[in-house]
């Protein structure tokens, strides 16, 4: 299924932050990826190709992100308990056609050991 729960490890914790992995099929050339927390857009990244196959990357809601040929990673820092929620990767495929939207997601559990600046 291309929709539904992520069938891969979506959350990777390090240094009091989390990397949220949003995968897309590697044939996808042009797309928009949004990271949703509940129903709210936290971050987005749009990849388009212009004439001469020049690649353009744009963000309207900027987060620290990283693009590979089959995933976008969004990074959230200074984790606290308020970050616990459902997170969704909302992918809009523009190329190759036809247009398609897919949603995959999972619940981010926050445990004490993953918090940023615990008091010892």
């Amino acid at each position: 299924e291309i929709n539904g729960s992520a069938n891969y490890e979506m959350f990777i914790f390090h240094n009091g932050g989390v990397q949220i992995l949003c995968k897309y099929p590697d044939i996808v050339q042009q797309f928009k990826m949004q990271l949703l927390k509940g129903g709210q857009i936290l971050c987005d990244l749009t990849k388009t190709k212009g004439s001469g196959n020049t690649v353009s990357i744009k963000s309207l809601k900027f987060c620290h992100s990283q693009l590979s040929n089959n995933s976008v990673s969004f990074f959230l820092y200074n984790l606290d308990h308020s970050h616990a929620n459902y997170y969704f990767c909302n992918l809009s495929i523009f190329d190759p056609p036809p247009f398609k939207v897919t949603l995959t997601g999972g619940y981010l559990h926050i445990y004490e050991s993953q918090l940023c600046c615990q008091l010892k």
């Epitope: 291309i2 044939i27 996808v28 190759p96 056609p97 036809p98 247009f99 897919t102």
Partner: antibody, heavy 124, light 109 residues
């Protein structure tokens, strides 16, 4: 081998909705888009819309948005197109065709396999 | 909505090379339109020939090839045969929808 099977003909009364079928075999049905195309006698081809069987995501030609509804039954590998309130303008041959785009397999981006078409006659 | 235009009819002779073209009302056809060529023979027999501008479908003879020529998509039949007599439709993708040309009736005399 890949096949898209459609009934040869359907007769429907004006105003009574009709559901056309397209049974797929010989490939992973849920992994490829199915398109529907209309051909009126002596005229060209009109794209109606498409559906991705895995999650039933659809796109429609605006001209058919209120006329056609695309669905699938994954258990029987069958795509359907329902036409509401048909009139004589809807009398035509309707084809289903596979768009060779899979998000998981090799891609060559062609409308490779076509059904033989269903001739729909709207008449009282 | 975009309009896709093809020659209405062409005539060729066996063994000759013939090129059919496909023009978009929105400007130059590009690889992002994923141009398709489909053959229609009598009794509603449709066969996909070319997709993604220049990918030949399995089982399609090598004499059929697709390309971009100038601002148009093109289907070239190199060494036409009598069985190539048919109607040829091109189709272009515009993001989330597909537009067909009016078709070219090819006669091989």
């Amino acid at each position: 081998q890949v096949q898209l099977q459609q009934p040869g003909a359907e007769l429907v009364r004006p105003g009574a909705s009709v559901k056309l079928s397209c049974k797929a075999s010989g490939y992973s049905f849920t992994s490829y888009w199915i398109n529907w195309v209309k051909q009126r006698p002596g005229q060209g081809l009109e794209w109606i819309g498409n559906i991705y069987p895995s999650d039933s995501y659809t796109n429609y030609n605006q001209m058919f948005k209120d006329k056609a509804t695309l669905t699938v039954d994954k258990s029987s590998n069958t795509a359907y197109m329902q036409l509401t309130s048909p009139t004589s303008e809807d009398s035509a041959v309707y084809y289903c065709t596979r768009w060779n785009l899979s998000y998981y397999f090799d891609n060559n981006y062609y409308l490779d396999y076509w059904g033989q078409g269903t001739t729909l006659t709207v008449s009282s | 909505q975009a309009v896709v235009t093809q020659e209405s009819a062409l005539t060729t002779s066996p063994g000759e090379t013939v090129t059919l073209t496909c023009r978009s009302s929105t400007g130059a056809v590009t690889t992002s339109n994923y141009a398709n060529w489909v053959q229609e023979k009598p009794d509603h027999l449709f066969t996909g020939l070319i997709g993604g501008t220049n990918n030949r479908a399995p089982g399609v003879p090598a004499r059929f090839s697709g390309s971009l020529i100038g601002d148009k998509a093109a289907l070239t039949i190199t060494g036409a045969q009598t069985e190539d007599e048919a109607i040829y439709f091109c189709a272009l993708w515009y993001n989330n929808h597909l537009v067909f040309g009016g078709g070219t009736k090819l006669t091989v005399l």
